[in-house]
């Protein structure tokens, strides 16, 4: 039911990477507008994106308050120019989103190799600790701050002259690997959260190779 010419939103989908979280839905509005509400399972509803003609709403500011909570959102449909109008039951049309738990479900963004440094036959590879929009004591937390040891990185490395790859893991943001003297190597990293059952992996970082400007070589 609902007001004539007003259709309920559908295909409500959470799009979230490194906790930047947007709710998307359909359809593109024709003579109607939307308002979104979000709440935790036990909390009150908070309205966002009032009377918008967009079909997305950035809910990051709400979910970063507690990324381990489970959130539910709903999208209300109103006739354009008559937002006080309600459906036949006295309520505007709305549709619920799936539940969303940021800590378990946010996608891991593509990591970046910050630097690598060779000392003799060892190379130290450092992964950039990306800043998130999660705050604690007015400070933005990094991905490592949020996930702690739940977050691991897998390093893939190979001689520039061959395709055979090797791999190593760390639950910090640094790798220390053995390499052959006089050989140039290429590196790529992937973030993984082993405790998850879905969305466990990031895409691979861009490849960085020795002999390019990111690294530093020291013969000792």
């Amino acid at each position: 039911s609902g007001t004539t010419n007003t259709v309920a939103a559908y295909n409500l989908t959470w799009k979230s990477t490194n906790f930047k979280t947007i709710l998307e839905w359909e359809p593109k509005p024709v003579n109607q507008v939307y308002t979104v509400q979000i709440s935790t399972k036990s909390g009150d509803w908070k309205s966002k994106c009032f009377y918008t003609t967009d079909t997305e709403c950035d809910l990051t500011d709400e979910i970063v308050k507690d990324v381990k909570q489970t959130y539910l959102a709903r999208v209300f449909s109103y006739p354009a120019g008559n937002v006080e109008s309600t459906g036949s039951a006295g309520e505007p049309l709305y549709e619920n989103s799936p539940e969303f738990t940021p800590y378990l479900e946010t996608n891991l963004g593509q990591p970046t190799i910050q630097s690598f440094e060779q000392v003799g036959t060892k190379v130290n590879v450092t992964v950039e600790d990306e800043r998130t929009l999660v705050r604690r004591n007015n400070t933005f937390l990094s991905l490592r701050d949020v996930f702690g040891k739940d977050l691991i990185y897998t390093l893939y490395y190979w001689k520039s002259s061959s395709s055979g790859k090797k791999t190593a893991k760390t639950n910090t943001n640094e790798f220390l690997i053995d390499v052959d003297k006089g050989e140039n190597y290429c590196f790529s990293v992937q973030a993984v959260i082993p405790s998850r059952t879905v969305n466990r992996k990031s895409t691979d970082s861009p490849v960085e190779c020795m002999g390019q400007e990111k690294g530093e070589f020291r013969e000792i």
């Epitope: 791999t167 992937q190 082993p194």
Partner: antibody
Framework: QIQLVQSGGEVKKPGASVRVSCKAS????????VYWVRQSPGKGLEWIGY????????IYDQNFKGKATLTVDKSTSTAYMELSSLRSEDTAVYFC??????????WGQGTTVTVSS | DIQMTQSPASLSASVGRVTITCLAS??????LAWLQKPGKSPQLLIYA?????GVPSRFSGSGSGTDFSFISSLQPEDFATYYC?????????FGQGTKLEIK
């Protein structure tokens, strides 16, 4: 429930090739690497390599480079290992296993490959 | 490559407490798993050196860096071969195995 079901045993002649399959079910196939391990008669476990179905990256033990080729078919959630130029020393039980990054938590039932003239 | 040296190679015991050790040739932090192979497929017992994977609490693991131990208060069904495996860097090597036999 999570299962890895491997293809049946094979008897092959020296110099031939064999393909062993490992069909995964009960979990998101691309979220976990698939490892391959072998156990030769009277010996311990030997790591062959792994494939990441998410990005297609393969890592091999040096001893199995050129011997084993790992592939996946994401549409059927199946991992494959092809062994080429078989010799009697390749006679073994071959296992696939799911990698949870910190360990191998689910294993296939094993496939016996016998190489004999 | 990281070598894993497991000892003893075999152990005869009646029910009671047994300890198996695993020594890594270089530091692997806690990237170590213990597996039981009772004749068929291996089964994961312990991951990250100390964490039980849904197995009875009579099993335990300890250690980090290069020295690791696996302890079990044996039950009749525990007679099998046990392996440590490092999952820190490729190749992800196994120990040689410890065969636990009934005395």
């Amino acid at each position: 429930q999570i299962q890895l079901v491997q293809s049946g045993g094979e008897v092959k002649k020296p110099g031939a090739s064999v393909r062993v399959s490992c069909k995964a079910s009960g979990y998101s196939f691309t979220d976990y690497n698939v490892y391959w391990v072998r156990q030769s008669p009277g010996k311990g476990l030997e790591w062959i390599g792994y494939i990441d179905p998410y990005n297609g990256i393969t890592i091999y033990d040096q001893n199995f480079k050129g011997k084993a080729t790992l592939t996946v078919d994401k549409s059927t959630s199946t991992a494959y290992m092809e062994l080429s130029s078989l010799r009697s020393e390749d006679t073994a039980v071959y296992f696939c296993a799911r990698d949870v990054t910190t360990a191998l938590d689910f294993w296939g039932q094993g496939t016996t490959v016998t190489v004999s003239s | 490559d990281i070598q894993m040296t497991q000892s003893p190679a075999s152990l005869s015991a009646s029910v009671g407490r047994v300890t198996i050790t695993c020594l890594a040739s270089q530091t692997i932090d806690t990237w170590l798993a213990w597996l039981q192979k009772p004749g068929k497929s291996p089964q994961l017992l312990i991951y990250a050196a100390t964490n039980l994977d849904g197995v009875p609490s009579r099993f335990s693991g300890s250690g980090s860096g290069t020295d690791f131990s696996f302890i079990s208060s044996l039950q009749p069904e525990d007679f099998a071969t046990y392996y440590c495996q490092q999952v820190y860097s490729s190749p992800f090597t196994f120990g040689q195995g410890t065969k636990l036999e009934i005395k």
